[in-house]
């Protein structure tokens, strides 16, 4: 039930990558507007995106307060131009989102290889430690700061001249691998959180190859 010509939101979906978190829903509004509320399981509701005609709401600022909490959001529908109006039960029409726990569910963004340096038959490959919007003591935390050893990186590497790949793992942001002298190699990395059951892996980083500008070579 609800006010005439007002429909409840549906398909409420969390879209979250490296903790940047947006709630999306349907339908596109016709003669209605939306307001979103978010809370933790034990907390109070906080209103966001007041009387909007958008079908998304950026909730990053709320979820980064504690990424290990479980959040619930709800989307209220109001008739356009009459936002005081309520449904037949005396309150606006609303729909609940699925629960969302950022630490367990945010997608891992595509990583980037920051640099690689060859010294003789060793190559040190460094993965960029991406900054998130999670704050501690007024500074933004990196992905590694947030996940610690829960986050590992997998490196794929191969000789430019062949297709056979090798792989290595690190729970820091650096790899030190053995290579054949005089051979050029290509590299790609993937972020993984082994303890997760969903959204466990990122997509692979762009491929970087030796002989291109990110690398450095020393005898």
């Amino acid at each position: 039930s609800g006010t005439t010509n007002t429909v409840a939101a549906y398909n409420l979906t969390w879209k979250s990558t490296n903790f940047k978190t947006i709630l999306e829903w349907e339908p596109k509004p016709v003669n209605q507007v939306y307001t979103v509320q978010i809370s933790t399981k034990s907390g109070d509701w906080k209103s966001k995106c007041f009387y909007t005609t958008d079908t998304e709401c950026d909730l990053t600022d709320e979820i980064v307060k504690d990424v290990k909490q479980t959040y619930l959001a709800r989307v209220f529908s109001y008739p356009a131009g009459n936002v005081e109006s309520t449904g037949s039960a005396g309150e606006p029409l609303y729909e609940n989102s699925p629960e969302f726990t950022p630490y367990l569910e945010t997608n891992l963004g595509q990583p980037t290889i920051q640099s690689f340096e060859q010294v003789g038959t060793k190559v040190n490959v460094t993965v960029e430690d991406e900054r998130t919007l999670v704050r501690r003591n007024n500074t933004f935390l990196s992905l590694r700061d947030v996940f610690g050893k829960d986050l590992i990186y997998t490196l794929y590497y191969w000789k430019s001249s062949s297709s056979g790949k090798k792989t290595a793992k690190t729970n820091t942001n650096e790899f030190l691998i053995d290579v054949d002298k005089g051979e050029n190699y290509c590299f790609s990395v993937q972020a993984v959180i082994p303890s997760r059951t969903v959204n466990r892996k990122s997509t692979d980083s762009p491929v970087e190859c030796m002989g291109q500008e990110k690398g450095e070579f020393r005898e």
Epitope: T167, A168, K169, P194, N199, R200, K201, T203
Partner: antibody, heavy 117, light 107 residues
Framework: EVQLVESGGGLVQPGGSLRLSCAAS????????MHWWRQAPGKGLEWVGL????????IYDPKFQDRATISADNSKNTAYLQMNSLRAEDTAVYYC??????????HGQGTLVTVSS | DIQMTQSPSSLSASVGDRVTITCRAS??????LNWYQQKPGKAPKVLIY???SLAEGVPSRFSGSGSGTDYTLTISSLQPEDFATYYC?????????LGQGTKVEIK
């Protein structure tokens, strides 16, 4: 319930090929890495290779690089191992396993491949 | 490739005994070391991962220690169901390599 079921084993002529299947249920293989192992009768475990089904990356033990191909059909939630130019020493039980990136938490029951004329 | 040298290859022990199995890597494997138990005709089962972490559902009599190149699996008080073959596995870099196995038999 997570399950891995291998199939496709049996008797193969020397020089022949095999294609083993590993049908997964209870989880999406795209979220994990899928590996193939083998164990010759009375011998230790031997790693063949792995696939990341989502990205398509494959890694092989160099000793199998030229004869083994690991693939996956995500729509069927199934991983495959194709091995060519089989010889008697390839006789083994072949296992598939799910890798969390920390450890192998589930294995199939294994499928026996016998290479003999 | 990283070589894994496991010892002993077999041992005889009695129920209640403390059993120790060691694995040495040919170079630092940064604790990417798992221990597996295998019984005849069965698939391997993980006991310990990241050298020291007990896998879910594994009894606390199993423990792992070590770092760098040297790692140990300890069974504090051997139970009848523990008679099996144990393998160490390094998964820090490809190819994944295993020890030769340790068969734990009843004395």
């Amino acid at each position: 319930e997570v399950q891995l079921v291998e199939s496709g084993g049996g008797l193969v002529q020397p020089g022949g090929s095999l294609r083993l299947s590993c049908a997964a249920s209870g989880f999406n293989i795209k979220e994990y890495y899928m590996h193939w192992w083998r164990q010759a009768p009375g011998k230790g475990l031997e790693w063949v290779g792995l696939i990341d089904p989502e990205q398509g990356n494959t890694i092989y033990d160099p000793k199998f690089q030229d004869r083994a191909t690991i693939s996956a059909d995500n729509s069927k939630n199934t991983a495959y191992l194709q091995m060519n130019s089989l010889r008697a020493e390839d006789t083994a039980v072949y296992y598939c396993a799910r890798d969390t990136a920390a450890y192998f938490d589930y294995h199939g029951q294994g499928t026996l491949v016998t290479v003999s004329s | 490739d990283i070589q894994m040298t496991q010892s002993p290859s077999s041992l005889s022990a009695s129920v209640g005994d403390r059993v120790t199995i060691t694995c040495r890597a040919s170079r630092d494997i940064k604790s990417y070391l798992n221990w597996y138990q295998q019984k005849p005709g069965k698939a391997p089962k993980v006991l310990i991962y990241y050298a020291t972490s007990l896998a879910e559902g594994v009894p606390s009599r199993f423990s792992g220690s070590g770092s760098g190149t040297d790692y140990t699996l300890t069974i504090s008080s051997l139970q009848p169901e523990d008679f099996a073959t144990y393998y160490c596995l390094q998964h820090g870099e490809s190819p994944w390599t295993l020890g030769q196995g340790t068969k734990v038999e009843i004395k």
